[in-house]
Amino acid sequence: RGVFRRDAHKSEVAHRFKDLGEENFKALVLIAFAQYLQQCPFEDHVKLVNEVTEFAKTCVADESAENCDKSLHTLFGDKLCTVATLRETYGEMADCCAKQEPERNECFLQHKDDNPNLPRLVRPEVDVMCTAFHDNEETFLKKYLYEIARRHPYFYAPELLFFAKRYKAAFTECCQAADKAACLLPKLDELRDEGKASSAKQRLKCASLQKFGERAFKAWAVARLSQRFPKAEFAEVSKLVTDLTKVHTECCHGDLLECADDRADLAKYICENQDSISSKLKECCEKPLLEKSHCIAEVENDEMPADLPSLAADFVESKDVCKNYAEAKDVFLGMFLYEYARRHPDYSVVLLLRLAKTYETTLEKCCAAADPHECYAKVFDEFKPLVEEPQNLIKQNCELFEQLGEYKFQNALLVRYTKKVPQVSTPTLVEVSRNLGKVGSKCCKHPEAKRMPCAEDYLSVVLNQLCVLHEKTPVSDRVTKCCTESLVNRRPCFSALEVDETYVPKEFNAETFTFHADICTLSEKERQIKKQTALVELVKHKPKATKEQLKAVMDDFAAFVEKCCKADDKETCFAEEGKKLVAASQAALGL
């Protein structure tokens, strides 16, 4: 039943070129190269892509031509290794080129940098962008792919093609509008925010596959697809999971051409079989390919079938529980997960996986016991505290969010997480806590039945950002422990951390709290980040500071910024009032 079984092709590069078409082929090769060599200039990448494309065309004309039988990894790796400045720019990554495939590709993958040292993307004036778009549309769009791909080396490549299509549409429409800025800027903001979210979600999928293995990813996919397609039978869900796992394994492994091709095949299969999958797919399946795949990935959950029987009969009361577990462990656990998930769209995927893990652990123990049935008879009772923990946490945090609003809620989380893991770098703590805080506006507006899947699965994505950033420069054993022990228990692990009593407070440095007039010209978001950076530093200096003390200092700081930004001589105000503020803060915190 595999969608992806194809006849062997003499030339893999010709096969993919023909399947994808020249435009998508070139775009995907550019993404692949930019995700591997993140520091290379745009022009160098374009040159490499053009060379690969010309070579692919010779293979399309004659699949038996020289080198056309080589694997894509060999062809692309050889091309990347021709870059003259590899050693100077990338250091030890150049050693990858001494290796043979598949080790060479694995080596490139290991050197992908989640936080590359690249300048922040600054958005030019609208007229400047529209001129660039009109002057050379192709180069303008390639530049977009390149800049996103190099900053997000795990971005889901076929989805990036969809973003690029929307980016092009925005410029096509808005550069002709009467008020170009009013038309374009909200669209670009939306693409930026959606793009960051898409990147983070895909990063979790790749981390799941690479750090915890295919079984972990498949379990996640069974749970999510069973919630989304509760009318589909288990065999259908299993088939979709197998195919989806192949697609994501390819994309996470840098096999972007195969990934995009297989994703298109999967979308085609889903649309051809929507009657046995979901009633919600009709609109998606009428769209063009890129929109169709995106739409399917985001489609709402179908309605649950009526009168689903209790799970207890088959998974607790049946005489065959241990026989099923012994004969086909993973299939039986998969069935349990499928049956539980399709009945519980109100649970987060990670909660469903915790329940399945509890069920597995219980059977592992009980099926070896003298009276297995007596041993596992109460297994469903063990689920109650696991369900209540995230429910209570979400209730408490949504109440706090509604009381404080997003900015102050983020600040509460900044303090909470800095106290838990003060060794983590300030920019990482600010970024992660800001994102954790966004769970409020994103999820607390939902009714109870949608809050948990929204909140806890979003938190898994954000905490994975912390994990991948921390993995690059490990500084905290507690972060390492929570990140590596269990994928599904990461959030409960971080929630359970208390103040780190072993932490030695950071030395006070007045420079950290010295501000200048440039803060006045920053956007509201940038100004918030400056204040939140100061808040993290305060907590690092005084981890035992109370909420009241920190609030008082932050209120004084806000007043100080407001006052000096209204002053005639802003710089003098910041210098003089800043010294007073630092002294007052030190006194207030007993530094």
């Epitope: 039978e233 288990f234 065999a235 299993s238 079938p305 689903l308 029987p309 009969a313 088959d314 049946s318 005489k319 065959d320 026989k323 099923n324 004969e327 086909a328 299939v331 039986f332 069935m335 049956e339």
Partner: nanobody, 123 residues
């Protein structure tokens, strides 16, 4: 509980074909293993064919290549297509089901049974 009702039995000449059907009700059975057994007069009930959740089929050696078991989960039915019938295929044919991942071949492993349908093959 699962209720099973067989249909399609009858009298057929040797070399002919017959199709049996088994309709399940009471609860969804798409993940259940389903099987056909038969019992000739004065003999033990014997395994004929079984099919599991992912439509993997197994057959008794005596019917391999002649009988085909299939399932339609949308209709909650299991079918047995019998070709090249022989007089020794004469028996009461029973449909059975159980929640097992791997379809068993032993009658005692099955929890739910139909009332049976008579198949007679004349020479």
């Amino acid at each position: 509980q699962v209720q099973l009702i067989e249909s399609g039995g009858g009298l057929v000449q040797a070399g002919g074909s017959l199709g049996l059907s088994c309709a399940a009700s009471g609860r969804p059975v798409s993940n259940y293993a389903a099987a056909w057994f038969r019992q000739a007069p004065g003999k033990e009930r014997e395994f004929v064919a079984a099919i599991n959740w992912n439509k993997t089929a197994t057959y008794a050696d005596s019917v391999k290549g002649r009988f085909t078991i299939s399932r339609d989960n949308a209709k909650s039915t299991v079918a047995l297509q019998m070709n090249s019938l022989k007089p020794e295929d004469t028996a009461v044919y029973y449909c059975a089901a159980v929640f097992r991942v791997v379809a068993p071949k032993t009658q005692y492993d099955y929890d739910y049974w139909g009332q049976g349908t008579q198949v007679t093959v004349s020479s």
